[in-house]
């Protein structure tokens, strides 16, 4: 069997954050929007994701997961730069790859200790371990050495994708699974709120049920319909009146109606 | 429908081996869909996990730091079960003892369990 | 460790009456789109835990519909719309956000 290393250890530098708001607990806000953000986490001291609501909240919240550690881990651009010319790489990046307990089907990337180069890898979307990136970029900056491998043969073509909001889905199949595509939405003139909100429903990836809410910015009325549990894109609310409170205020009816809240 | 049926003694000694064993009956232990895993029950500790094992493109383990040192959970395809050992057993392991299958694709809970077994640490 | 800290530890009900249970994590368990990372169990007087409620808010099959679960972040709740006698037992929430899996200490239900 495949024994993992344990990977609960702070992944750099020190305990202690460089800034005080980097040990304020996640807030996601009063708001219902579902924005994915990252905040320092004083517990693991890991920069880990959140869903963040769209206002209020705190400073512990980053747009991106460089920038959470660039902000709130002490020594860490030295040590992606340690990373990046060879001299040392974090321990997580000679984990081998675990796909993790649950079955979803989302594109990761992890450094292959054998090949020596960043690979992409299906993750199932809960625990596994830190060798899993979001990006390839972000794989090689903190694992890769450009040194042993300044063009990989194999390395992924971005092209190759289709990126849809937070998700990146793959135009062929995943074990065996037509993985779909959301068809590309044109932004209607007559709406001037959240992007997602003019996606199409996506019911993802998995195999469950859960009733879930998008927003159909034709009929400006949020509609149920059924999610399967990863995947899929930020059209998704877990109830009507969320779907609503979050994107029908960008509806423009016309200009003698105003805004329909 | 699947079902867990546990079996092993009741009664270990100190500094023993706490062997327990599961057979899965309605669902495989080198199922995709499934993980396997092994959790107890006692007054003073409420549930704690110990550990599971899982098969995708291989097989992986992970388990608890808190017995990391003593335990092994494997699977044994030929009988469609998975086991439990806990060595240099003491005092403090006394407890009931669940396997638990973690569904993986709908779920992702543990959605099935054994029927328990209390192992009582003694001499 | 993620620690899930439950309340009441005990929760006296009258059948008919609603009720509910809190679970608070010491980090957030919510994942991308909504999915969050907690379960609910209850275990009846001399049996095995039995899953209730998974990824925070969806029944799980045979479960009755008075049970739902919601929160987000690090606050949970489980709610039973109108308690019956069947549901008194131990309900636990467990998450699996990171390793170890952690269960929270558990609250007992009781008929008044």
């Known amino acids: 069997l495949s024994e993992e290393a344990d990977d609960t250890d702070s992944e750099l530098g020190s305990m202690k954050p460089l800034h005080t708001f980097c040990a304020m607990k996640a807030d996601d806000g009063p708001c219902k929007a579902m924005i994915r953000s990252y905040f320092f986490n004083m517990y693991t001291h890991q920069c880990e994701e959140f869903i963040y609501g769209g206002c209020e909240g705190n400073e512990n919240r980053f747009d991106t997961l460089e920038e959470c550690k660039k902000t709130c881990i002490p020594g860490y651009e030295k040590t992606a730069v340690k990373a990046a010319s060879g001299a040392e790489r974090p321990d997580f990046c000679f984990l081998e790859e675990d796909p993790g307990l649950c079955r979803g089907y989302m594109k990761r990337y992890l450094y292959n200790n054998q090949t020596k180069q960043c690979e992409r890898f299906v993750y199932g979307g809960c625990l596994g371990n830190r060798n899993n990136f979001e990006t390839l970029d972000e794989c090689k900056k903190i694992c890769e050495n450009p040194v042993h491998s300044p063009s990989p043969v194999n390395e992924v073509q971005m092209s190759d994708y289709v990126t849809d909001g937070n998700t990146v889905t793959d135009r062929s199949t995943v074990n065996n699974i037509v993985v779909p595509q959301s068809p590309k939405v044109p932004r209607r003139r007559d709406y001037r709120g959240r992007p997602w909100c003019l996606q199409p429903a996506d019911s993802g990836l998995c195999k469950a049920s859960e009733r879930r809410f998008y927003y159909n910015s034709a009929t400006g009325k949020c509609h149920r319909f059924n999610y399967t549990g990863c995947g899929g894109n930020n059209n998704n609310f877990t109830t009507r009146r969320r779907c609503l409170r979050s994107c029908k205020t960008g509806l423009i009816k016309n200009k003698s109606k105003g805004v329909v809240k | 429908q699947v079902q867990l049926q546990q079996s092993g003694p009741g009664l270990v000694k100190p500094s023993q081996t706490l062997s327990l064993t599961c057979a899965i009956s309605?669902?495989?232990?080198?199922?995709?869909?499934?993980?396997w895993s092994w959790i107890r029950q006692s007054p003073g500790r409420g549930l704690e996990w110990l550990g599971i094992i899982y098969k995708r493109s291989k097989w992986y383990n992970r388990y608890a730091v808190s017995v990391k040192s003593r335990i092994t959970i494997n699977p044994d395809t030929s009988k469609n079960q998975f086991s439990l050992q806990l060595n240099s057993v003491t005092p403090e392991d006394t407890a009931v003892y669940y396997c638990?299958?973690?569904?993986?694709?709908?779920?992702?809970?543990?959605?099935?369990w054994g029927q328990g077994t209390l192992v009582t640490v003694s001499s | 460790d993620i620690v899930l800290t439950q309340s009441p530890l005990s929760l006296p009900v009258t059948p008919g009456e609603p009720a509910s249970i809190s679970c608070r994590s010491s980090q957030s368990l919510v994942f991308r789109f909504g999915i969050t990372y907690l379960n609910w169990y209850l275990q009846k007087p001399g049996q095995s835990p039995q899953l209730l409620i998974y990824k925070g808010s969806n029944r799980a099959s045979g479960v009755p519909d008075r049970f739902s679960g919601s929160g987000s972040g690090t606050d949970f709740t489980l709610k039973i719309s109108r308690v019956e006698a069947e549901d008194v037992g131990v309900y636990y929430c467990q998450q699996y956000t990171s390793y170890p899996l952690t269960f929270g200490q558990g609250t007992k239900v009781e008929i008044k």
């Open positions: 309605g669902d495989s232990v080198s199922s995709d869909s499934a993980a």
């Open positions: 638990a299958r973690w569904h993986s694709d709908k779920h992702w809970g543990f959605d099935d």
